[in-house]
C-alpha cells in the first residue's frame, strides 16, 4: 500500500487504478477510517457520505476536508477495459502545522553551579503530537538528568484532537562569565517538514555572587524576653546554593550544628548577650551579620537597647 | 439547499477590530467541509485568509496569522471572523465560503477601514 | 508560498470562437493522484462560482463549453464556443498547501 499525509481541512484525492477514466466503470471503494465501524463501502452513485468522501466521475475518492478521523485505510478494487481487476490500497494520515514555539517565563540570567530553570518551551494545536527540543548554541541537548533536564508536558485538545506540547528546561552551568543561547524546534517527524524554531535567547551565566545581604531577624521583636520564654534568631541569606550557617555570642562561637535558625527555648538571665550569624558559602567564603542584643527582663521594664533589633525585625549596627 | 450569509458593521475606524459572521443554512458546520473566509480588495485581488474545520481546529494565511482568528458557535451553525489592528489596506469585500472546494458562496460583505 | 500566475490579464473573444485562460502555479500544485486546482467565474456584484475543480472535473450544472486541463504547474481554462453570458472574469486557485488565487482573467465578448 501507499502511505499518504493530508494536512487537516484541506482536500485529498486517492486515485482508483486501473479504473476507466469515464463512467462506465466498476468499482468500489472501502474505508476503514475513525468515522467507520469496520469497513464501510462506497459507490458511485453517491449519497449521504458525499460530505466527508465522495467519488469522482473519473473513479478517484475526493476526501473535502480531511480530519483526524479520516485517518486509516482506504481501499479500491476496479475492473479495467480488459476485464482485470485492479487494486489500490492507500494507508492515510493527517497532520497540523502548529504556530511558532514560544520560550515562555525565560530566565533573564543563569547561575553557575546550581540548577536554573532556563524557560519553558510551549507549541500549540499539533497533530500528531510531534516532540520539542532544546539546542545549545545551535547543537541538540541531551538530556542527562543531572545537568540538563527535561519536564515534559502534553495535553490534547477535547473538541479539535489538537495537541499542546510543553517542555521545561532546567541546566546546571558549570562555570561564570559565559553567554550560552538556547532555542526549543518542534518536529512533525513527517518526511520533507522543516522544524519550527523559536526565537533564541542568549543568557548570561554569572559565578555564585557573595550573598547581597545577610539579615538577622529576631522574635519577639526587639530582642527583649521576659524569663521562660522563647527566642527566636532567623539568619535569612539571600545566596544559592544556601550557604552554612553558623553562631556566634558575644564574639565566640557557639558549638551547634550549622542551621539557618537558632532557637532558645526558656530562657534565662545566662542566654543575654550579642548573638550574630555567620553565612559560610564554598567559593566566598563568611559573610557576618550584624549583631542583635537579647535582654532578659521582666515586660515593660526597659525599651530597646542601643544596638538592638528595631521595629522591622532586622538587626541594625549601633 | 446550503447557504451562507455574512453580516457585521460595513464601517469600521483604523486600529480598532473588525468582527465579521457567517451563519450557515441547510448544513452542519461540524458534519463536515471546512469553513472559509476570503477578501476581495477594490482592484478585484482575491485573498483567501483562514478556515476553520468541522472540527474546530483552524489554519491562516501566514500574512494575516498575528492578526487573525477564526472561531465558530456550533449551536447557531455560525462562524466568524476577527481581524485586529485594521488599516484602510483591510478595505475590502468580505466572503465566506465552504472548503474543499468552494463549490458555496456568501454573497460578501463591503467592509470599509476609515477614520 | 505557492503563487499563481494567470494569463492574459485580459482577453476579447468573438461569439462562438475558443477562449484559453492560463494559470502557472511557483510549485507543483499535483500529487500522483490528483492536481489540486480550481477555476471559478466572478461576474460584478457576485462572489466568484465554481466552474471547475480538481483541474478537469466540471462542477455540476456548469455548462460542457468549459473544461480545464493541466498537471503540475500548468493549468489551461478553455470555453469554447464562448456565449454572450460568459463575459466575466475568472480565477485559478490551489489547495494544494493553504490556498492561494490568481490575479483574474477579465474575458469580454466581442
Known amino acids: 500500500g501507499q502511505n499518504i499525509t493530508a494536512r487537516i481541512g484541506e482536500p485529498l484525492v486517492l486515485s482508483c487504478k486501473g479504473a476507466p477514466k469515464k463512467p462506465p466503470q466498476q468499482l468500489e471503494w472501502k474505508l476503514n477510517t475513525g468515522r467507520t465501524e469496520a469497513w464501510k463501502v462506497l459507490s458511485p452513485q453517491g449519497g449521504p457520505w458525499d460530505s466527508v468522501a465522495r467519488i469522482l466521475p473519473n473513479g478517484s475518492l475526493l476526501l473535502p476536508a480531511t480530519g483526524i478521523v479520516d485517518e486509516g485505510t482506504f481501499r479500491c478494487r476496479a475492473t479495467n477495459r480488459r476485464g482485470k481487476e485492479v487494486k489500490s490500497n492507500y494507508r492515510v494520515r493527517v497532520y497540523q502545522i502548529p504556530g511558532k514555539p514560544e520560550i515562555v517565563d525565560p530566565a533573564s540570567e543563569l547561575t553557575a553551579s546550581v540548577p536554573n530553570k532556563v524557560g519553558t518551551c510551549v507549541s500549540e494545536g499539533s497533530y500528531p503530537a510531534g516532540t520539542l527540543s532544546w539546542h545549545l548554541d545551535g547543537k541538540l541537548l541531551i538530556p542527562d538528568g543531572k545537568e540538563t533536564l527535561v519536564k515534559e508536558e502534553t495535553r490534547r485538545h477535547p473538541e479539535t484532537g489538537l495537541f499542546t506540547l510543553r517542555s521545561e528546561l532546567t541546566v546546571i552551568p558549570t562555570q561564570g562569565g559565559t553567554h550560552p543561547t538556547f532555542s526549543c524546534s518542534f518536529s512533525l517527524g513527517l518526511p520533507r517538514r522543516r522544524p519550527l524554531n523559536t526565537a533564541p535567547i542568549q543568557l548570561r551565566v554569572r559565578e555564585p555572587g557573595p550573598p547581597e545581604g545577610i539579615q538577622l531577624l529576631v522574635e519577639p521583636e526587639g530582642g527583649i524576653v521576659a524569663p521562660g520564654g522563647t527566642v527566636t534568631l532567623t539568619c535569612a541569606i539571600s545566596a544559592q546554593p544556601p550557604p552554612q550557617v553558623h553562631w556566634i555570642k558575644d564574639g565566640a562561637p557557639l558549638p551547634l550544628a550549622p542551621s539557618p535558625v537558632l532557637l532558645l527555648p526558656e530562657v534565662g538571665h545566662e542566654d543575654e548577650g550579642t548573638y550574630s550569624c555567620v553565612a559560610t558559602h564554598p567559593s566566598h567564603g563568611p559573610q557576618e551579620s550584624p549583631p542583635v542584643s537579647i535582654r532578659v527582663t521582666e515586660t515593660g521594664d526597659e525599651g530597646p537597647a542601643e544596638g538592638s533589633v528595631g521595629e522591622s525585625g532586622l538587626g541594625t549596627l549601633a | 439547499d446550503v447557504q451562507l450569509q455574512e453580516s457585521g458593521p460595513d464601517l469600521v475606524k483604523p486600529s480598532q477590530s473588525l468582527s465579521l459572521t457567517c451563519t450557515v443554512t441547510?448544513?452542519?458546520?461540524?458534519?463536515?467541509?471546512?469553513w472559509h473566509w476570503i477578501r476581495q480588495f477594490p482592484g478585484n485581488k482575491l485573498e483567501w485568509m483562514g478556515y476553520?474545520?468541522?472540527?474546530?481546529?483552524?489554519n491562516y494565511n501566514p500574512s494575516l496569522k498575528s492578526r487573525i482568528s477564526i472561531t465558530r458557535d456550533t449551536s447557531k451553525n455560525q462562524f466568524f471572523l476577527q481581524l485586529n489592528s485594521v488599516t484602510t489596506e483591510d478595505t475590502a469585500t468580505y466572503y465566506c465560503?465552504?472548503?474543499?472546494?468552494?463549490?458555496?458562496w456568501g454573497q460578501g460583505t463591503l467592509v470599509t477601514v476609515s477614520a | 508560498d505557492i503563487v499563481l500566475t494567470q494569463s492574459p490579464a485580459s482577453l476579447a473573444v468573438s461569439l462562438g470562437q475558443r477562449a484559453t485562460i492560463s494559470c502557472r502555479a511557483s510549485?507543483?500544485?499535483?500529487?500522483?493522484?490528483?492536481?489540486?486546482m480550481h477555476w471559478y467565474q466572478q461576474k460584478p456584484g457576485q462572489p466568484p462560482k465554481l466552474l471547475i475543480y480538481?483541474?478537469?472535473n466540471l462542477e455540476s450544472g456548469v455548462p460542457a463549453r468549459f473544461s480545464g486541463s493541466g498537471s503540475g504547474t500548468d493549468f489551461t481554462l478553455n470555453i469554447h464556443p464562448v456565449e454572450e453570458e460568459d463575459a466575466a472574469t475568472y480565477y485559478c486557485?490551489?489547495?494544494?498547501?493553504?490556498?492561494?488565487f490568481g490575479g483574474g482573467t477579465k474575458l469580454e465578448i466581442k
Open positions: 441547510g448544513y452542519s458546520i461540524t458534519s463536515g467541509y471546512s
Open positions: 486557485q490551489h489547495s494544494r498547501e493553504l490556498y492561494t
Open positions: 510549485k507543483s500544485v499535483g500529487t500522483s493522484d490528483s492536481s489540486y
Open positions: 476553520i474545520h468541522y472540527s474546530g481546529s483552524t
Open positions: 465560503a465552504r472548503g474543499g472546494d468552494f463549490a458555496y
Open positions: 480538481l483541474a478537469s
